[in-house]
Interface confidence: low
């Protein structure tokens, strides 16, 4: 048994006579043989669920669900109740109605076995019948909505009459009907005004019925019509078995370069026309078991269940359904030597499904794990300037397919054939498993005899000790030119183009810093700045070489504070800046400021123009300009 509503509403007035009928509550059956029996909770409740008093006023007919006044609620009783309402004015009280057999303990009131009946209290006597508006004669203030379980026996779930009005105003005639399309499963009896279902409902055919209730009031010669929505929601049960959309029950996958834990190897989709179990219970009741149960499979793979609500069209209306994605996921990083082919299965069980048929499906995954070989080109040839500064990036080495790798660890090493000319270093990039070649020793770079540098590049997967090797020939070009006096260690310090381009800094491949001219479009990723190499800095990413020293590219790597208009990088650096951004790495600070035109940079014409505008516009305009500048600084 279950209530067709979780809440009912009616009005209560002072001194309403004992015996006044208030309203009917309705229960619907889950099985044909069930007989409802109603029981009222012992207490009246007020604001914030405050227990006010034992209920001495309202009774229920156990078999019909009719609530009525057992004794009149007089003013003194009402004041006594109000005094217990935690100081709030008592505008609404409620009772709990239970369906027997249920537990006799009056605890939480949860649908389907309990409903709340709310009474709006008016501290006056019942109004004169002639003063009641048609709306008040027809329907309660709060519009009802109904919930009916699918596949259950038909039954009565509502009674239209407002019983106190009918009882106290017998001369007013009120008639009701339901506006509904042909063939709908509801009926309003013209005599009793009871609304019932004609047959069991099927949620998978239709989930919501937006009906309209029409009330016609006859008072003397007056006839008025009132219409209100009458919504019915069909509640789901697990009566649909899971199926494969388009019959696809098998997925094939190859695990090769993507071998990282949490990699999704393959996905299969299951469709279920039901939306139960509800999300909180779904994973517990919709189970999936990975087969075979051998330890290698169980440790290497897991199945992730991703349910999602969807909507499907049925009989011209949309109803909700569920799609379940089952992802076969790597449970651990796979060694590059791992080489096997297997047939895995996932047993999916909709454990709440009662039939007919089985609520079980078998999903098939054909998985090939291929070994990965490490290969390098036979040789690399690069050139480097004698003027290059320490940490200048001069190239990359990369085993075959390294950009596609994930979960594969490759470490690169350089072995120099000439000990005194060991200029370069290599670090492995976490992003694409490549090795970045950089200048590590500038002294060796300047030695005249170090004109050609010979290295062996060795790429190793330490997990399997597999290796690949390649020759690297580096040609040293150009002449060494000493650094200008007073140049900073970091290119990023320079705020203007001339001072930027006359100095070098850490990470500079040419021995000179490069100016990047921004686009001047407010706070932009393309801000103006001084960089050791605009190829790598700033690019919104603090790479593995730049992490070696904060002076190389603080624009990408600084963890300190940024003053002025900017958007911070994630997790560090400047993502976007206003105007020109320069940095002081030792102080862990960067500044992004408007690109102000300094007089030395102005030509005659520009200076003249500036003077004219200042003289013409006077002091007030100048003040506004400074104010404007100040505003930009803050934003």
């Amino acid at each position: 048994l279950y209530f067709s509503r979780d809440a009912y509403w009616e009005k209560l007035y002072v001194d309403q006579p004992a015996g006044t009928p208030l309203l009917y509550v309705h229960a619907l059956r889950d099985a044909p043989e069930e007989v409802p029996s109603f029981r009222l909770g012992q207490h009246l409740y007020g604001t914030y669920r405050t227990r006010l008093h034992e209920n001495n006023w309202i009774c229920i007919q156990e078999d019909t669900g009719l609530l009525y006044l057992n004794r009149s609620l007089d003013r003194s009783s009402w004041e006594k109740l109000s005094g217990r309402n935690r100081g709030f004015p008592l505008l609404t009280v409620y009772l709990k109605v239970f369906l027997s057999p249920t537990s006799l303990r009056e605890g939480e009131c949860q649908w389907p076995g309990c409903a709340r009946v709310y009474f709006s209290f008016f501290n006056t006597s019942f109004p004169a019948c002639t003063s009641l508006k048609p709306r008040e004669l027809c329907f309660p203030e709060t519009r009802p909505s109904f919930r009916i379980r699918e596949n259950r026996p038909p039954g009565t779930f509502h009674q239209f009459r407002l019983l106190p009005v009918q009882f106290l105003c017998p001369n007013i005639s009120v008639a009701y009907r339901l506006l509904e399309g042909e063939g709908l499963p509801f009926r309003c009896a013209p005599d009793s005004l009871e609304v019932s279902t004609r047959w069991a409902l099927d949620r998978e055919q239709r989930e919501k019925y937006e009906l309209v209730a029409v009330c016609t009031v006859h008072a003397g010669a007056r006839e008025e019509v009132v219409m209100v929505p009458f919504p019915v929601t069909v509640y789901d049960e697990d009566d649909s078995a899971p199926t494969f959309p388009a019959g696809v029950d098998t997925a094939s996958a190859v695990v090769e370069f993507k071998r990282k834990e949490d990699t999704v190897v393959a996905t299969l989709r299951v469709f279920d026309a039901d939306v139960v179990p509800a999300s909180g219970e779904l994973v517990r009741r919709y189970t999936s078991t990975l087969l075979p149960g051998d330890t290698w499979t169980q440790q290497t793979f897991r199945v992730e269940h991703w349910p999602n609500e969807t909507s499907v069209q049925a009989n011209g209306s949309f109803v909700r359904a569920t799609v379940h994605d089952y992802r076969l996921v790597l449970n651990r990083n796979l060694s590059i030597s791992e080489n096997r082919t297997m047939q895995l299965a996932v047993l999916v069980n909709d454990s709440d499904f009662q039939g007919p048929g089985a609520g079980v499906l078998l999903l098939h995954f054909n998985v090939s794990v291929l070994p990965v070989s490490l290969h390098l080109p036979s040789s690399y040839s690069l050139s480097v300037s004698r003027r290059a500064r320490r940490f200048a990036q001069i190239g990359k080495v990369c085993v075959e397919n390294c950009q596609a790798f994930s979960g594969i660890n490759v470490q690169y090493e350089l072995h120099s054939s000439g000990a005194n000319c060991s200029t370069l270093g290599v670090v492995t990039s976490a992003e694409d498993t490549s090795g970045i070649l950089f200048v590590n020793d500038t002294k060796a770079l300047r030695r005249p005899k170090c004109a050609e540098l010979h290295y062996m590049v060795v790429a190793t997967n330490h997990q399997t000790s597999r290796q690949a090797q390649a020759q690297l020939l580096v040609t040293v070009e150009g002449l060494y030119v000493a650094e200008e006096a007073g140049c900073p260690l970091s290119c990023a310090v320079s705020k203007r183009r001339p001072e930027c381009e006359e100095c070098g800094g850490l990470g500079s491949p040419t021995g000179r810093c490069e100016w990047r001219q921004g686009d001047g479009k407010g706070i932009t990723r393309n801000f103006s700045t001084c960089s050791p190499s605009t190829k790598t800095c700033p690019d919104g990413h603090c790479d593995v070489v730049e992490t070696q020293d904060i002076n190389i590219c603080p624009q990408d790597c600084l963890r300190g504070s940024i003053v002025g208009g900017h958007e911070p990088g994630e997790p560090r650096g400047i993502k976007a800046g206003y105007g020109t951004c320069n940095c002081f790495p030792e102080e862990e600070k960067c500044f992004c400021e408007p690109e102000d035109i300094q007089d030395p940079l102005c030509d005659e014409l520009c200076r003249e123009q500036k003077l004219i505008s200042e003289e013409d516009l006077g002091g007030e305009q100048k003040l506004i300009s400074e104010e404007d500048l100040h505003h930009h600084h803050h934003h």
Epitope: E261, T295, W296, Q298, R332, N333, S335, H462, Q463, T464
Partner: antibody
């Protein structure tokens, strides 16, 4: 820093039950698989059980299957081992250990252990 | 279950000696092998994982090698604090299994 503190050990008669707890701190508990390993007096290490990070999977050594259950409360950063039908050969120091998220099942941090003595 | 055979079960050595401990598995486990050190009354401490990779903070005198079924832990120059029991452990499949241990004592 990573810390694992076991508790709940003691002396118990054969056939009785005991519940061990392991309080974790200094790392994001919900991201790591957690294990129980035991060591009988004067003997070597024996792995007992594991609970995966999300609580979805668990495995046991054959000798405790059906008697021991492993659980975790990610909201309280705590791992549990419920030991029922205890036998004399379950006497050991029980360690809780964290599984590092690198290849294979590597136990990178261990608690100080709690002694369980099963004796009549 | 994968069986782990560790040898020797004990050895005596002097400070400065080179010490080698071996571990053999009943089936190939590629490189899913870890080494732990345990001192009396203390919890085990991870030294080497994935057969040859050093856990951070572990002195460089400890190294691991091997793959498949045969693995070795080497202490290049034994120090006073290295006297302890060493265990290998396979992490290829459950149940996880440990070797019987090798006790390194002062000669």
């Amino acid at each position: 820093q990573v810390q694992l503190v076991e508790s709940g050990g003691g002396v118990v008669q054969p056939g009785r039950s005991l519940r061990l707890s392991c309080a974790a701190s200094g790392f994001t508990f919900r991201n790591y698989g957690m294990h129980w390993v035991r060591q009988a007096p004067g003997k070597g290490l024996e792995w007992v059980a594991v609970k995966r990070y999300d609580g979805s999977d668990e495995y046991f050594v054959d000798s405790v299957k059906g008697r021991f259950t492993i659980s975790r409360d990610n909201s309280k950063n705590t791992l549990f081992l419920q030991m029922n039908s205890l036998r004399v050969d379950d006497t050991a120091v029980y360690y809780c250990a964290r599984e590092t998220p690198i290849t294979g099942t590597t136990l990178d941090y261990w608690g100080q252990g709690t002694l369980v003595t099963v004796s009549s | 279950d994968i069986q782990m055979t560790q040898s020797p079960s004990s050895l005596s050595a002097s400070v400065g000696d080179r010490v080698t401990i071996t571990c053999r598995t009943s089936q190939s486990i590629t490189n899913y092998l870890n080494w732990y050190q345990q001192k009396p009354g203390k919890a085990p401490k991870l030294l080497i994982y994935a057969a040859s990779r050093s856990q951070s903070g572990v002195p460089s005198r400890f190294s691991g090698s091997g793959s498949g079924t045969d693995f070795t832990l080497t202490i290049s120059s034994l120090q006073p604090e290295d006297f302890a029991t060493y265990y290998c452990q396979q992490s290829y499949s459950t149940p996880l299994t440990f070797g019987g241990g090798t006790k390194v004592e002062i000669k």
